[in-house]
């Protein structure tokens, strides 16, 4: 769970399940970041990627976009694939809310997801053989 | 808020505040993703980045790592900076839990954060590879 210091003046802090369950206000702070248009780096990158829609109605957010690198190599100045380099996904662990019961929409559980956000071009690891 | 279909058999679904507040179980599902070894792409990328620690005890997760691109240009084969292209941050919107009251650790609010996860190398020309 989350180990926050507990204040004696708070109701239910002695509850044996605390901090197993917490109350979460779903009126999102900083909601306006939603209005930004998605970046077009996916197309201009030397390691371009496609975005795939991952949808799950039992999860919040229900739609998550996942990146899949278009090429194994990276795009060079001439627009050809250079296989001496690799396009690799940059992954991030995110928190989502998973509905605990299909029937009761007000009870959730935190879930970790590993999502690919975009791709970057890396030099391959050269293995030196003795 | 989150618009999930409401089941008539669920307690409190008629509450005028629903679905303003929900109960969240903090025993995280898929916790084991935490054990994965951090990638070294940040160092091997043609658009390398540094990771900066963003810490906030009133937030869960309290520590978030943010990427800052090391260079304006991208690193070429010789290890020099190529200013014909740019290193740019790949940003993602994530959900975090923000403590609503400093004193009561069991009441939270969802908050959106825009974080830079890593960097990619972009060109001014979109190359379409057959």
């Amino acid at each position: 769970g989350i180990a926050f210091p507990q204040n004696p003046g708070c109701r239910n802090t002695e509850d044996k399940n605390f901090p197993q369950h917490v109350k979460v206000n779903l009126n999102i702070l900083n909601r306006n970041t939603n209005s930004r248009r998605p970046s077009d780096y996916y197309n201009r990158s030397t390691s371009p990627w496609n975005l795939h829609r991952n949808e799950d109605p039992e999860r919040y957010p229900s739609v998550i976009w996942e990146a899949k690198c278009r090429h194994l190599g990276c795009v060079n100045n001439e627009g050809n694939i250079n296989y001496h380099m690799n396009s690799v996904p940059i992954q991030q662990e995110i928190l989502v809310l998973r509905r605990e019961s299909q029937h009761c929409p007000h009870s959730f559980r935190l879930e970790k997801m590993l999502v690919a956000v975009g791709c970057t071009c890396v030099t391959p690891i050269v293995r030196h053989v003795a | 808020g989150i618009a999930f279909p409401q089941n008539p058999g669920c307690r409190n679904t008629e509450d005028k505040n629903f679905p303003q507040h929900v109960k969240v179980n903090l025993n995280i599902l898929n916790r084991n993703t935490n054990s994965r070894r951090p990638s070294d792409y940040y160092n091997r990328s043609t658009s390398p980045w540094n990771l900066h620690r963003n810490e906030d005890p009133e937030r869960y997760p309290s520590v978030i790592w943010e990427a800052k691109c090391r260079h304006l240009g991208c690193v070429n084969n010789e290890g020099n900076i190529n200013y014909h292209m740019n290193s740019v941050p790949i940003q993602q919107e994530i959900l975090v839990l923000r403590r609503e009251s400093q004193h009561c650790p069991h009441s939270f609010r969802l908050e959106k954060m825009l974080v830079a996860v890593g960097c990619t190398c972009v060109t001014p020309i979109v190359r379409h590879v057959a």
């Epitope: 248009r37 970046s39 | 240009g73 200013y83 941050p89 001014p124």
Partner: antibody, heavy 118, light 110 residues
Framework: EVQLLESGGGLVQPGGSLRLSCAAS????????MSWVRQAPGKGLEWVSA????????YYADSVKGRFTISRDNSKNTLYLQMNSLRAEDTAVYYC???????????WGQGTLVTVSS | NFMLTQPHSVSESPGKTVTISCTRS????????VQWYQQRPGSSPTIVIF?????PSGVPDRFSGSIDSSSNSASLTISGLKTEDEADYYC?????????FGGGTKLTVL
């Protein structure tokens, strides 16, 4: 279609301040570095300042360093130029431009005239 | 800072070809892209060549750009000149800290 619309120009006394805005549309604003370029009456183009797509990096011409501040609000698709301690030689049409990459100004606005005079 | 030097003016007849040069005073021109902008009287600049030799969509193929590393200079060539090509043309390049424009060349189509 890329559109850049500058506003905020006008007449100001030497030593005064002005804030220019550039409203952008038709492209992914946060993906692009943005620049301000000016043109004094009857003269050539002079680069003033630039800012990275995320807003984390800013750059200035020596002639305006310490007096002008570039910023952006990606949630509003707007670029700003805060101009302080204005001088007569700052009189110019100020253009905002979208950079394809750093130093490559691909699209320009129509400009806004700033006149510094007593 | 480096400087970009252009001829003050050039003139040529319709249908002919004209070349405008742009010389970089210091730092290798090959390390940084060169752009060319057209500015008609009373209008904003528009890009006609970017990344040394790339033409944005909508710019006719009569416009071409090139660089010559040996002379550290760039050139804009306009073939099949038309009266609407009459304008000021600015070259532009950059380094990691600044962006520089040439002084501009006034093209007159006779």
């Amino acid at each position: 279609e890329v559109q850049l619309l500058e506003s905020g120009g006008g007449l100001v006394q030497p030593g005064g301040s002005l804030r220019l805005s550039c409203a952008a549309s038709g492209f992914t604003f946060s993906s692009y570095a943005m620049s301000w370029v000016r043109q004094a009456p009857g003269k050539g183009l002079e680069w003033v300042s630039a800012i990275s797509g995320s807003g984390g990096s800013t750059y200035y011409a020596d002639s305006v360093k310490g007096r002008f501040t570039i910023s952006r609000d990606n949630s509003k698709n707007t670029l700003y130029l805060q101009m302080n301690s204005l001088r007569a030689e700052d009189t110019a049409v100020y253009y905002c431009a979208r950079d394809l990459i750093w130093g490559v100004a691909g699209s320009w606005g129509q400009g806004t005239l700033v006149t510094v005079s007593s | 800072n480096f400087m970009l030097t252009q001829p003050h003016s050039v003139s040529e007849s319709p249908g002919k070809t004209v070349t405008i040069s742009c010389t970089r005073s210091s730092g290798s021109l090959a390390n940084y892209y060169v752009q060319w902008y057209q500015q008609r009287p009373g209008s904003s600049p528009t890009i006609v060549i970017f990344a040394n030799n790339q033409r944005p969509s909508g710019v006719p193929d009569r416009f071409s750009g090139s660089i010559d590393s040996s002379s550290n200079s760039a050139s804009l060539t306009i073939s099949g000149l038309k009266t609407e090509d009459e304008a000021d043309y600015y070259c532009q390049s950059y380094d990691p800290h600044s962006v520089v424009f040439g002084g501009g060349t006034k093209l007159t189509v006779l």
